[in-house]
Amino acid sequence: EPTMYGEILSPNYPQAYPSEVEKSWDIEVPEGYGIHLYFTHLDIELSENCAYDSVQIISGDTEEGRLCGQRSSNNPHSPIVEEFQVPYNKLQVIFKSDFSNEERFTGFAAYYVATDINECTDFVDVPCSHFCNNFIGGYFCSCPPEYFLHDDMKNCGVNCSGDVFTALIGEIASPNYPKPYPENSRCEYQIRLEKGFQVVVTLRREDFDVEAADSAGNCLDSLVFVAGDRQFGPYCGHGFPGPLNIETKSNALDIIFQTDLTGQKKGWKLRYHGDPMPCPKEDTPNSVWEPAKAKYVFRDVVQITCLDGFEVVEGRVGATSFYSTCQSNGKWSNSKLKCQPVDCGIPESIENGKVEDPESTLFGSVIRYTCEEPYYYMENGGGGEYHCAGNGSWVNEVLGPELPKCVPVCGVPREPFEEKQRIIGGSDADIKNFPWQVFFDNPWAGGALINEYWVLTAAHVVEGNREPTMYVGSTSVQTSRLAKSKMLTPEHVFIHPGWKLLEVPEGRTNFDNDIALVRLKDPVKMGPTVSPICLPGTSSDYNLMDGDLGLISGWGRTEKRDRAVRLKAARLPVAPLRKCKEVKVEKPTADAEAYVFTPNMICAGGEKGMDSCKGDSGGAFAVQDPNDKTKFYAAGLVSWGPQCGTYGLYTRVKNYVDWIMKTMQENSTPRED
């Protein structure tokens, strides 16, 4: 507890002090006082630098004195032999004796009293920035007019802080400008603009005069601008040393003007204004900005449109453009969005064709569709080459996004028919010679495949069985072989409307319009043993002349057997209709005159006994295409005949092409269209 006075005596005083002793006293007087310590008696063994025995006086870390020997007062009116005056309120006294004393020493007697100190004059560092006022036990600071005492109660400054500027334009100057600014002041000014505007400060060099920097380059008085985490300055000197236009990139700016006690100059004056926050003109590849400007600022909106072949993908959805807004923080919205090359994705598969994997599926990539040759060809042209277009579709120059259509090649047998050894009016044949040949098992008959979904046959073949079982692709129609061949399932039978349906078909004498179409449930896959025959064209090139040769094939009656197991074929010439009329009907069911002959019939045969017969009905009479010798077309269908091995009558297919096309068109699926 601090005291105002006290007494300190060496051990055993006034008797001799003992050897080997160390004792200390901590003196403390109240705050605001100094200590006056004085000795009235001093009798301590004398040694050089008081090395043996001593009394030591310490103030903080400083040794104020070290005493030994004998002292007497110089003043007859005062008992004081030694004294110390310290301007601090704490003091330590330490007494030490060594192991031996040659004489008897009585030690010391000392007293301390608290004394007033003049804080205003007693210290090197002046405690007050302006006026210092001493009183007993303390002091106080005071300020000149228009200054105020800071919270530290020592420093005076002018009241220049706390101003907040919110207007978009303004002027700020140091206190008293252009008169000298106050010393020892810290002036803080705040500029706070609405978000989206940056503070731009402009100064003129001549409007700035602040005490210059010291020799180390440190500003004694300084002006500093702080915008968020960016600092401009400190600035000082005669004439503004910084940029005359400071773009802070922030809507908040703190201006701090700090002055010391000396060297007042006229100060500074600045102007500020709020600029809409600029957003950088970013380099966004593969795109254009609309509107195009040299500078974009807060609230500006641009439409960024991707160049052709590029798109912006957001949430797995592609778009060709997006909007971006210059935000209050100087950054663009949607800045993560980028124009990237359009991806057309995996190309679609096509029936009876293929597409090679492209190196890439991105914009500009090229793919090529091909058909399964030689059985299919590309019907709708375009060459099969597609490129990845800007809209994300695979596009062909001719067809656009429409895919190529692979349709069966017609009328081309894999192996041409060659008449080998004669077998009673015909030759053995292979299905590869007549890949269009269809076998009907009930009734035993034939038909001709004309495309993936349609079989052409004679009306009399299907009039009694509207759900015929058909087979393709096999030379032999042995049951074991048929099991391995392709069975065709009918969906619907279309008999020509001109075909007269009879109660008793066996007595038929009128075979006019003996033609029918069978629509298949599933498409037929073409190959070396299954391939359609062409239909005749409608031009006069397809009008048959007498003597024109055609091929017939089937598993019908031969001279030896009622039914053939292996496919037979023959080449026969077209004959005048009268030749057929002249042949006597074998086993007639009516008068010879009752048999009807019409222009819808072709007469053929009569050579070397080659003819079609029972069981061949519905098969094609195949003639070489006059415009393409590599192809055969179905000129006729085996219909009827007066007598096997003579002349036969064939339905003239050319007369029914319109009906065939119309029927197929009206009963197709979207896949065929």
């Epitope: 797995r316 994705g345 995996i346 597409v355 599926t361």
Partner: antibody, heavy 118, light 109 residues
Framework: EVMLVESGGGLVKPGGSLRLSCAAS????????MSWVRQAPGKGLEWVAT????????YELDSVDGRFTISRDNSKDTLYLQMNSLRAEDTALYYC???????????WGQGTLVTVSS | QIVLTQSPATLSLSPGERATLSCTAS???????LHWYQQKPGKAPKLWIY???NLASGVPSRFSGSGSGTDYTLTISSLQPEDFATYYC??????????FGQGTKLEIK
């Protein structure tokens, strides 16, 4: 006749791996893009992955990307799905399907069941 | 991704009645790339209608499909016993993922 037959499913612990196969027949396998689609018990269909006809381009569902890999061997007419780091939520019947016009899935296998459980 | 929402989740009708199944997309879908599948319990799905309105092979003509943009419909003019199944709509979009609706279960009332 087009046929797709999946195999390789079974019971596996979380974190484990499986390789599903899909054997194709009745069509020219190398001409068609193929997909895997799964169906969790009592739930709807979820597309998993697609591969182009030649096998150079693949797309996978985000939640399986990096864990599942679709591939094919056209010489063997077989489609594969390599499934690593399996999770309980991958439990499902996995179907392979052929992609036809406009990426419709015109033929599907009968499915193979994958159960992920500890 | 494009989300397909089918409604209703379950549709209870009697044979002979007309059924209308709806599929709504979260964003526009090309008509060419919207397909429908039929699935019966324990069986694999079957392509039923492709490109919005084209019937797959073997699908009876009582089925029809229509729609454009975000709204698509599968209609059965007169329900037959074999039509009771779950129907899924499905869309393809080049940026993926391919998505399916959650399904509509068509059950006998």
């Amino acid at each position: 006749e087009v046929m797709l037959v999946e195999s390789g499913g079974g019971l596996v612990k979380p974190g484990g791996s499986l390789r599903l196969s899909c054997a194709a027949s009745g069509f020219t396998f190398s001409n068609y893009a193929m997909s895997w689609v799964r169906q969790a018990p009592g739930k709807g269909l979820e597309w998993v992955a697609t591969i182009s006809s030649g096998g150079s381009h693949t797309y996978e569902l985000d939640s399986v990307d990096g864990r599942f890999t679709i591939s094919r061997d056209n010489s063997k007419d077989t489609l594969y799905l390599q499934m690593n780091s399996l999770r309980a939520e991958d439990t499902a019947l996995y179907y392979c399907a052929r992609l036809f016009t406009k990426h419709a899935m015109d033929y599907w296998g009968q499915g193979t069941l994958v159960t992920v459980s500890s | 991704q494009i989300v397909l929402t089918q409604s209703p989740a379950t549709l209870s009708l009697s044979p002979g009645e007309r059924a209308t199944l709806s599929c709504t997309a979260s964003s526009e879908v090309s008509e060419s790339y919207l397909h429908w599948y039929q699935q019966k319990p324990g069986k694999a799905p079957k392509l039923w209608i492709y490109s919005t309105s084209n019937l797959a092979s073997g699908v009876p003509s009582r089925f029809s499909g229509s729609g454009s943009g975000t709204d698509y419909t599968l209609t059965i003019s007169s329900l037959q016993p074999e039509d009771f199944a779950t129907y899924y709509c499905h869309q393809y979009y080049r940026l993926h993922p391919i998505t399916f609706g959650q399904g509509t279960k068509l059950e006998i009332k």
